[in-house]
Interface confidence: medium
């Protein structure tokens, strides 16, 4: 049997709670040799692909998906998969992006610390995940 592909990980920079209009970058990581990374939104039917893959470490590659100006519609659940010929990997755990109104106050942090979901992590026990929006019938639409 061929070698199993490790599950990818996903993280968000600078964090998972982003003020309206600010930027966020999703970072997908997998093993070396990845040809394509895919960032999925809510399900496998809505996604963006990139072949702009860089080597993050001797054993790891990564791709970055940037949203320059976050809108309320960008809130939701994101996960990564990758293509390492000739196989697609499984999906990473979900990461939930939250969008908040800009408070502007000097004592209000703009973001929560970066969060990630990776291969050895159990699904986070995060009750607001139950409000995952349905994405019924979407077919390979772009994320942003």
């Amino acid at each position: 049997q061929e070698e199993d592909l490790p599950r990818p990980s996903i993280s968000a920079e600078p964090g998972t709670v982003i003020p309206l209009g600010s930027h966020v970058t999703f970072v997908c990581r997998g093993p070396v040799g990845v040809q394509t990374f895919r960032l999925e939104r809510d399900s496998r039917s809505t996604y963006n692909d990139t072949e702009d893959v860089s080597q993050a470490s001797p054993s790891e590659s990564e791709a970055r998906f940037r949203i320059d100006s976050v809108r309320e519609g960008n809130a939701g659940l994101y996960r990564c998969i990758y293509y390492k010929p000739p196989k697609w990997s499984e999906q990473s755990d979900y990461l939930e992006l939250l969008v908040k109104e800009s408070s502007g106050g000097p004592d209000s942090p703009d973001t929560e610390p970066g969060s990630s979901a990776g291969p050895t992590q159990r699904p986070s026990d995060n009750s607001h995940n139950e409000h995952a929006p349905a994405s019924q019938g979407l077919k390979a639409e772009h994320l942003y």
Partner: antibody
């Protein structure tokens, strides 16, 4: 129309072996689906056996099924479940199910009609 | 090993009533929880996925919710056609543990 269908159910003697096949129609394994096997003994509840990810090849088993049951992808449209050392307790309808294409969270929204395995001497 | 404890095993309510079914996961599974309806001699039918999302074509009388590792299926305005057995299932297949386990099922009888 997307569908899955099980075949291979039969009457088998105790300690015997059997291979069930799940045949997919209307979709490609290359997209990467969890193809799962679930069984249901007469008058009992659903029991998860395991799943194979159709692209990566990763396989997950219920602890009770490891060693005796084997899941494998045998072609671009078929997944097999090999049953060995069968006992009367393995008498059940065996379902093949696929996780959803349009919903996140991997629920099984495509189920076959099931195939009956009877273990009896 | 992940264990899904479903209660009650059986419930009987009149037409128009409300049924509440609970499913307790033995460890965190985030929202990787689905609810299925099964009638005798039929294959299971997906009702709820992601703990609270309604599958396509399913009546809004079915509602799923989550609080930590406890999940609830509520059926309101019961109809005769709701008579069936309902199952919860963890739908997470991960590296740190194996999901897939079903709850024991709840038989719903509509009087």
């Amino acid at each position: 129309e997307q569908s899955v269908e099980e075949s291979g159910g039969d009457l088998v003697k105790p300690e015997g072996s059997l291979t069930l096949t799940c045949t997919a129609s209307g979709f490609s394994f290359s997209s990467g689906y969890y193809m799962c096997w679930v069984r249901q003994a007469p008058g009992k509840g659903l029991e998860w056996i395991g799943c194979i990810h159709s692209s990566s090849g990763n396989i997950y088993y219920a602890s009770w099924a490891k060693g005796r049951f084997t899941i494998s992808k045998t072609s671009s449209t078929t997944v097999d479940l090999q049953l060995t050392s069968l006992t009367a307790a393995d008498t059940a309808t065996y379902f093949c199910a696929r996780d959803s294409e349009v919903y996140g969270w991997n629920p099984n929204d495509l189920w076959g009609p099931g195939t009956l395995v009877t273990v009896s001497s | 090993e992940l264990d899904m404890t479903q209660t009650p095993a059986s419930v009987s309510e009149p037409v128009g009533g409300t049924v509440t079914i609970k499913c307790q996961a033995s460890q965190s599974i985030s929202s990787y929880l689905a609810w299925y309806q099964q009638k005798p001699g039929q294959r299971p039918k997906l009702l709820i996925y992601g703990a609270s999302n309604l599958a396509s074509g399913v009546s809004s009388r079915f509602k799923g919710s989550r609080s930590g590792t406890q999940f609830t299926l509520t059926i309101t305005d019961l109809e005769c056609d709701d008579a069936a057995t309902y199952y919860c299932q963890c739908s997470y297949y991960g590296n740190s543990y194996v999901g897939g386990a079903f709850g024991g099922g709840t038989e719903v009888v509509v009087k």
